[in-house]
């Protein structure tokens, strides 16, 4: 069987939802020694980079300029070593934000409520779309979907403490083409034992862990790989 | 300070509508869904229903979601209640209300709508 | 719709006297059970909410407990000025329904 380099890390520096006319950068990480990476869109080819010098760093970034919604939708990348070439990473949906109108998002029964109420986020948009997205910020790949004419209802159940936190919701054109972000509703959950409203905390895994760790080699070189071997494995 | 203040009482023939505003102040109007409830003399407190002035979306209790119409006026932070077909039992005070924090917590000083031939 | 049914519908008691009213709900209300305050000719004050919490600026003596149905609101030692109607309402399932409540008088 023809041998193959594992499958590289593929992600979106900062964040995968990208505003039109914006910069998106994807992050390629593969292995020291790599001398060319490949960034494949839909499954073509769309651009190549060759890190200089290859032995020395451990991906590389593709740049895309002016976003779109003809450049949203699914990345991957390759690398080779020599004439090795490694498997096809993991497909990464990269989004076009700032399409078209801003949603209203709203929470009933109210933005403060007590642990165990039922909660229903409403997202409504006026304009021609069937799809509404609702996210949680530091939360931003748990993307709940629902469908509707002009409003989609997100019933959340009876809510906890874990619950609390700001939501954003958008209205999608497809998949990969949302509108503005509406504006974000603080959701307040107090416990059953506390008195008081506890405002959001950090989450777990916060986005700004969607950054590119690509690192230049030192002695610290192995530790970092493993480190972000285990932060990847972590988000995942 | 968040006030609710409802428009003055109203004497209407059976048959007639009415139309009960109130007038929002002191937080986010388009935040917080506004209650209407009903209470007829020496009675007990009725929940009519719910708009939500950030969409207008809208619950109505059963019992008055064929003569009763929730609307607002984002632009002046007001809310409506109109109330058609009216009855003799339809003589009450009307209350807005809303739900700021845990419960109805704020409500307008009651709007008193007499019907009468 | 769940029925909210408050007893007794009117009570006298003395200055001082602890007061208790109950209210049983037609099903389980999961402690979504509020307690409010009306005083002749004025709109309706929030004294408790989810059973048991004081709403903010509410005396100590007011006090809420109850589970599943059924459901207490308890007035520690009454005072002149917590002359009023007193009723319950559930606020698990909509539409959001009240008791017929209390008249509370001084003896």
């Known amino acids: 069987p023809k041998q193959t380099l594992p499958k590289p890390i593929i992600r979106a520096e900062s964040t995968y939802m990208v505003p039109k006319e914006k910069q998106a950068t994807l992050c390629c990480q593969g292995s020291y020694g790599a001398v060319e990476y490949q960034l494949h869109f839909e499954g073509s080819l769309f651009a190549v980079e060759r890190p200089k010098p290859p032995e020395r760093i451990n991906g590389v970034k593709f740049h895309i300029p002016d976003m779109n919604s003809r450049k949203a939708g699914r990345y991957s990348c390759i690398y080779r070593v020599g004439e090795l070439w490694s498997e096809r990473s993991d497909l990464l949906d990269l989004v076009v934000t700032e399409m078209y109108d801003t949603p209203t998002l709203s929470v009933h029964p109210g933005p403060e409520v007590t642990s165990g109420e039922k909660v229903t986020f409403y997202c409504r948009l006026d304009t021609a779309t069937s799809m509404f997205l609702l996210l949680k910020e530091g939360r931003s790949r748990d993307v709940q979907r629902s469908y509707g004419k002009v409003q989609a209802e997100f019933p959340m159940g009876p809510v906890t403490t874990a619950h609390r936190g700001s939501y954003r919701c958008f209205g999608s054109y497809n998949n990969y083409a949302w509108s503005f972000p509406s504006e974000p509703v603080k959701l307040l959950v107090t416990g059953d034992i506390e008195n008081t409203s506890l405002a959001p905390t950090d989450p777990t895994f916060p986005d700004s862990w969607d950054t590119c760790l690509l690192t230049r080699e030192t002695g610290l070189q192995k530790d970092l790989a493993l480190w972000d071997h285990t932060a990847q494995n972590l988000l995942r | 300070q968040v006030q609710l203040v409802q428009s003055g009482a109203e004497v209407k023939k059976p048959g007639a509508s009415v139309k009960v505003s109130c007038k929002a102040s002191g937080y986010t109007f388009t935040t917080y869904w506004m209650h209407w409830v009903k209470q007829a003399p020496g009675q007990g407190l009725e929940w009519i229903g719910e708009i939500n002035p950030g969409n207008g979306g809208t619950n109505y209790n059963e019992k008055f979601k064929r003569r009763a119409t929730m609307t607002v006026d984002k632009s002046i932070s007001t809310a409506y209640m109109e109330l058609s077909r009216l009855r003799s039992d339809d003589t009450a005070v009307y209350y807005c209300?809303?739900?700021?924090?845990?419960?109805?917590?704020?409500w307008g000083q009651g709007t008193l709508v007499t019907v009468s031939s | 719709d769940i029925q909210m049914t408050q007893s007794p519908s009117s009570l006298s008691a003395s200055v001082g006297d602890r007061v208790t009213i109950t209210c049983r709900a037609s099903?389980?209300?999961?402690?979504?059970l509020n307690w409010f305050q009306q005083k002749p000719g004025k709109a309706p004050k929030l004294l408790i909410y989810?059973?048991?919490r004081l709403h903010s600026g509410v005396p100590s003596r007011f006090s809420g407990s109850g589970s599943g149905t059924d459901y207490t609101f308890t007035i520690s030692s009454l005072q002149p000025e917590d002359i009023a109607t007193y009723f319950c309402?559930?606020?698990?399932?909509?539409?959001?329904?009240f008791g017929g409540g209390t008249k509370l008088e001084i003896k």
């Open positions: 989810f059973t048991s």
């Open positions: 309402q559930q606020g698990n399932t909509l539409p959001p329904t």
């Open positions: 209300a809303i739900r700021l924090r845990f419960a109805l917590d704020y």
């Open positions: 099903q389980d209300v999961r402690n979504f």
